[in-house]
């Protein structure tokens, strides 16, 4: 048993049929010795009397808020949550496996630049009685500070018969050093509680590996005289790290016909302009990637050829 | 060329060669299905690698103030990786394919280190840890880890030289 937060405790249980469970001793926080009774949750049934209560925690029916009373007055309480371990593996019932970029990916994180700010998100089909708490640090043995906000519901989607809920959190490294080469990964830990079930999820990454720039901005076309060619120009996204002479991007320019089956023409360039042939009904798209490190490409910014 | 006394390197040449290094490092070890090598306990490998850290003066302001600290750090790293790529880890079994970019990568690391430090000038270099994996699979894993680490190192070096070429060239 360990303390999750003030007055909330997690009991770790091996979860198999007829498992013996864990013996937990609760002590009432009072100098009184006599007339103390114990109850669980909203029930008025007295579970025991005396300054301590010994319980065998085996299943969710044994978890909940234990309260000690004297003469109708509440003296103290402790909320017990369960963390299930099945076949040596902690349960992952609350969050959905996103399977990207690999199986057992429950948390996904992205950064728009090297400032030390990043966003993580996760998915669940659970809609109520659900709380999340997020902690983060750089490194684990001698951790350096990362501050995370509160996790919030950021999207709801219908997937077949099920509703899927996306939660996200923003974190910021306290003393970020954008120009340095990271040697210790960022660790993100999410505590998830659904009713009386506790689970924890972790992710470990370097900011450089989760970089995904915003799409290029101010994408414009300028027709060239007496030619089917156009000059495409764009700018670095506002959210990208500066100066751009140091934090440089590379770009991919694509000419795409109306039909997905049509051949795509692609040009790669480090400049913020390119000359391409604009076909009728086609569109021109540009996306960005860190010039020196192959992290994710941005989403496309697009304009129609006409 | 960067002389330890303090004259400027050939920023543009360094920029071109460092960008080529980035390309070679990624072609030597593309992101294979997001193989997370940090799960494989890499203390003995990458902890001893010279990282470009916050106080090394490789940020834009540090380069403007005095680029020598940063260039020395980059030089140290280039020599370190050049020795690793020439070691038994990469020359032993399993043999690299004849057209592997590792050979080119090795030569380019040496080329850039020489651009930074001409013959006869000596910056302090870092000791190479004695990594001699006995099993071919261990060697393969070590190669991947070293190349992943090198990708991060050359990315920072390339940013330094790109910025230098754009803002510090005479």
């Amino acid at each position: 048993i360990w303390e999750l937060k003030k007055d909330v405790y997690v009991v770790e249980l091996d979860w198999y049929p007829d498992a013996p469970g864990e013996m937990v001793v609760l002590t009432c926080d009072t100098p009184e010795e006599d007339g103390i009774t114990w109850t669980l949750d909203q029930s008025s049934e007295v579970l025991g009397s005396g300054k301590t209560l010994t319980i065998q925690v085996k299943e969710f029916g044994d978890a909940g808020q234990y309260t000690c009373h004297k003469g109708g007055e509440v003296l103290s309480h402790s909320l017990l949550l369960l963390h299930k371990k099945e076949d040596g593996i902690w349960s992952t019932d609350i969050l959905k496996d996103q399977k990207e970029p690999k199986n057992k990916t429950f948390l996904r994180c992205e950064a728009k630049n090297y400032s030390g700010r990043f966003t993580c998100w996760w998915l669940t089909t659970i809609s109520t009685d659900l709380t999340f708490s997020v902690k983060s640090s750089r490194g684990s043995s001698d951790p350096q500070g990362v501050t995370c906000g509160a996790a919030t519901l950021s999207a709801e989607r219908v997937r077949g018969d099920n509703k899927e809920y996306e939660y996200s959190v923003e974190c910021q490294e306290d003393s970020a050093c954008p120009a340095a080469e990271e040697s210790l990964p960022i660790e993100v830990m999410v505590d998830a509680v659904h009713k009386l079930k506790y689970e924890n999820y972790t992710s470990s990454f370097f900011i450089r590996d989760i970089i995904k720039p915003d799409p290029p901005k101010n994408l414009q076309l300028k027709p060239l005289k007496n030619s089917r060619q156009v000059e495409v120009s764009w700018e670095y996204p506002d959210t990208w790290s500066t100066p751009h002479s140091y934090f440089s991007l590379t770009f991919c320019v694509q000419v795409q016909g109306k039909s997905k089956r049509e051949k795509k023409d692609r040009v790669f360039t480090d400049k913020t302009s390119a000359t391409v042939i604009c076909r009728k009904n086609a569109s021109i798209s540009v996306r960005a990637q860190d010039r020196y490190y192959s992290s994710s490409w941005s989403e496309w910014a697009s304009v129609p050829c006409s | 060329r960067a002389v330890p006394g303090g004259s400027s390197p050939a920023w543009t040449q360094c920029q071109q060669l460092s960008q080529k290094l980035c390309t070679l490092a990624w072609s030597a070890h593309p992101l294979v299905g997001h193989m997370d090598l940090r799960e494989e306990g890499d203390e003995e490998t990458t902890n001893d690698v010279p990282h470009i850290q916050c106080g090394d003066g490789c940020d834009p302001q540090g380069l403007r103030d005095n680029s020598q600290f940063c260039l020395q750090r980059i030089h140290q790293g280039l020599i370190f990786y050049e020795k690793l790529l020439g070691s038994d880890i990469f020359t032993g079994e399993p043999s690299l394919l004849p057209d592997s970019p590792v050979g080119q990568l090795h030569a380019s690391l040496l080329g850039l280190s020489q651009l930074l430090q001409p013959e006869g000038h000596h910056w302090e270099t870092q000791q190479i840890p004695s990594l001699s994996p006995s099993q071919p699979w261990q060697r393969l894993l070590l190669r991947f880890k070293i190349l992943r680490s090198l990708q991060a190192f050359v990315a920072v070096a390339a940013r330094v030289f790109a910025h230098g070429a754009a803002t510090l060239s005479p």
Epitope: K6, D7, T27, D29, T30, P31, K51, S76, S78 | -
Partner: nanobody, 126 residues
Framework: EVQLVESGGGLVQAGGSLRLSCAAS????????AGWFRQDPGEEREFVST????????GYADAVKGRFTISRDNAKNTVYLQMNNLKPEDTAVYYC???????????????????WGQGTQVTVSS
């Protein structure tokens, strides 16, 4: 926020007694463990005694065990430190502090305490 005000300090002969009080205002004091610490000029703050939110758990520094008793009255939002058989080495400024911890929890670590009083001087003459 919790404001803490100590009182009851003063000058006393060796072997004498004093009772320090710590009155809390602001948020409900019963949601905080409380502690007494003392400090000599130029020295580190030293743990004296601690009591849990409900008063069921107490702790003492070895130097004061058997001589000092900590108690609390949550109805009055007050914590007390009864000091008997005082010695000249007990001379110090005594501080009351509040820690945001679970029921039944006490701590002697000053870093765990969120709120501190201004202190009250205790002088024991020989």
């Amino acid at each position: 926020e919790v404001q803490l005000v100590e009182s009851g300090g003063g000058l006393v002969q060796a072997g004498g007694s004093l009772r320090l009080s710590c009155a809390a205002s602001g948020r409900t004091f019963s949601t905080y463990a409380a502690g007494w610490f003392r400090q000599d000029p130029g020295e580190e703050r030293e743990f004296v005694s601690t009591i849990s939110r409900g008063g069921g758990t107490t702790g003492y520094a070895d130097a004061v065990k058997g001589r000092f008793t900590i108690s609390r009255d949550n109805a009055k939002n007050t914590v007390y430190l009864q000091m008997n058989n005082l010695k000249p080495e007990d001379t110090a400024v005594y501080y009351c502090a509040a820690a945001d911890v679970s029921y039944g929890t006490t701590t002697d670590d000053p870093k765990r305490y969120d709120y501190w009083g201004q202190g009250t001087q205790v002088t024991v003459s020989s």
